[in-house]
């Protein structure tokens, strides 16, 4: 039975050109994490394998950095980065756990509108 839960950084609103950290944390299970995949829509961004370490997809190498921990750092944000990001934890013996984070990247002109938030 899958007893674990995924906690995420929560949704993030950021400004174009900035950088953000996406993180997930798996709790309430003793299952072993064998691999964590980071995906956006149907695109694979990065893999962190327990044995082989990190692999960043070639198309994201310039703007995606591994960590901290099992998280992912996105740099030089563009409006095109707006979308849903998935952390997919492959575990044994539980199976797969998935967390979801929505990233909203705003043009500077929009970000200023009513801004009383900390903009990453």
């Amino acid at each position: 039975m899958m007893t674990g839960t995924i906690e995420t950084t929560g949704n993030i609103s950021a400004e174009k050109g900035g950088s953000i950290i996406l993180q997930c944390h798996l709790s309430s299970t003793t299952a072993q994490v064998t691999q964590v995949n980071w995906e956006q829509q149907d695109q694979l961004l990065a893999i962190c394998n327990a044995d082989l370490g990190w692999h960043i997809s070639p198309s994201f190498k310039d703007r995606v950095a591994p960590g901290p921990g099992l998280g992912l750092t996105l740099q030089s944000l563009t409006v095109n980065d707006t979308g849903e990001y998935f952390c997919i934890y492959h575990t044994y013996p539980d199976g797969t756990y998935t967390g979801r984070i929505f990233l909203e990247v705003l043009e500077s002109s929009v970000a200023e509108h009513g801004a009383r938030f900390q903009i990453p």
Epitope: G10, S13, E84, E104, V110
Partner: antibody, heavy 117, light 112 residues
Framework: EVQLQQSGPELVKPGASMKISCKAS????????MNWVKQSHGKNLEWIGL????????SYNQKFKGKATFTVDKSSSTAYMELLSLTSEDSAVYYC??????????WGQGTTLTVSS | DVVVTQTPLSLPVSFGDQVSISCRSS???????????LSWYLHKPGQSPQLLIY???NRFSGVPDRFSGSGSGTDFTLKISTIKPEDLGMYYC?????????FGGGTKLEIK
């Protein structure tokens, strides 16, 4: 002035599909997300999901995955939500709403959907 | 999914009253950057819902200052300082920090 103009009420048969439109004006259509909300029984509000008109990225409430599909036509600043395999449970008022920082700033007038044979 | 519980379900008032509506979430609504995406809406009969407050306490443009929001973490409050006839209707809170976004069940503000 920001305006979201939705298509009119619909009466459809069970099993059919239908598409609601939401025409945006008064702002840059691609600069904000477009959200869809369901209101059942005149009370409960449910977030169906959103689409980012800039790149077509979508996010769905899992409850509505396979039920709702979002698209946009940037040339006419119009967002669409198609509802599939309709049942009486889908009878409701559906709203489009412009999103910013995970709140719903401006709402359309609502589209009433009645599913009945 | 994050469960958002709103109280009370119904709030009978007289014009001029001050009232509070509570919204509680099943987990913290602060993201890793310290931003909390909790907003409040008023839905009047025959109209579309309208945004009152976003980010816990920021009044949306054109919203009178008799409306105020407060709270943190999992506990949030909407206060209306002097009830006017145009304030009657259903009030909803919405959390947008976690996927999927979830609404509270609503509070009906009505005349005693």
């Amino acid at each position: 002035e920001v305006q979201l103009q939705q298509s009119g009420p619909e009466l459809v048969k069970p099993g059919a599909s239908m598409k609601i439109s939401c025409k945006a004006s008064g702002y840059s259509f691609t600069g904000y997300t477009m959200n869809w909300v369901k209101q059942s029984h005149g009370k409960n509000l449910e977030w169906i999901g959103l689409i980012n008109p800039y790149n077509g990225a979508t996010s769905y409430n899992q409850k509505f995955k396979g039920k709702a599909t979002f698209t946009v036509d940037k040339s006419s600043s119009t967002a669409y939500m198609e509802l599939l395999s309709l049942t009486s449970e889908d009878s409701a008022v559906y709203y489009c709403a412009r999103g910013l920082r995970f709140s719903l700033e401006y709402w359309g007038q609502g589209t009433t959907l009645t599913v009945s044979s | 999914d994050v469960v958002v519980t709103q109280t009370p379900l119904s709030l009978p008032v007289s014009f001029g009253d001050q009232v509070s509506i509570s919204c509680r979430s099943s987990q913290s609504l602060a993201n890793s950057y310290g931003n909390t995406y909790l907003s409040w809406y008023l839905h009047k009969p025959g109209q579309s819902p309208q945004l009152l407050i976003y980010g816990i306490s920021n009044r949306f443009s054109g919203v009178p200052d008799r409306f105020s929001g407060s709270g943190s973490g999992t506990d949030f409050t909407l206060k209306i300082s002097t009830i006017k006839p145009e304030d009657l209707g259903m009030y909803y809170c919405l959390q947008g920090t976690h996927q999927p976004w979830t609404f509270g069940g609503g509070t009906k503000l009505e005349i005693k």
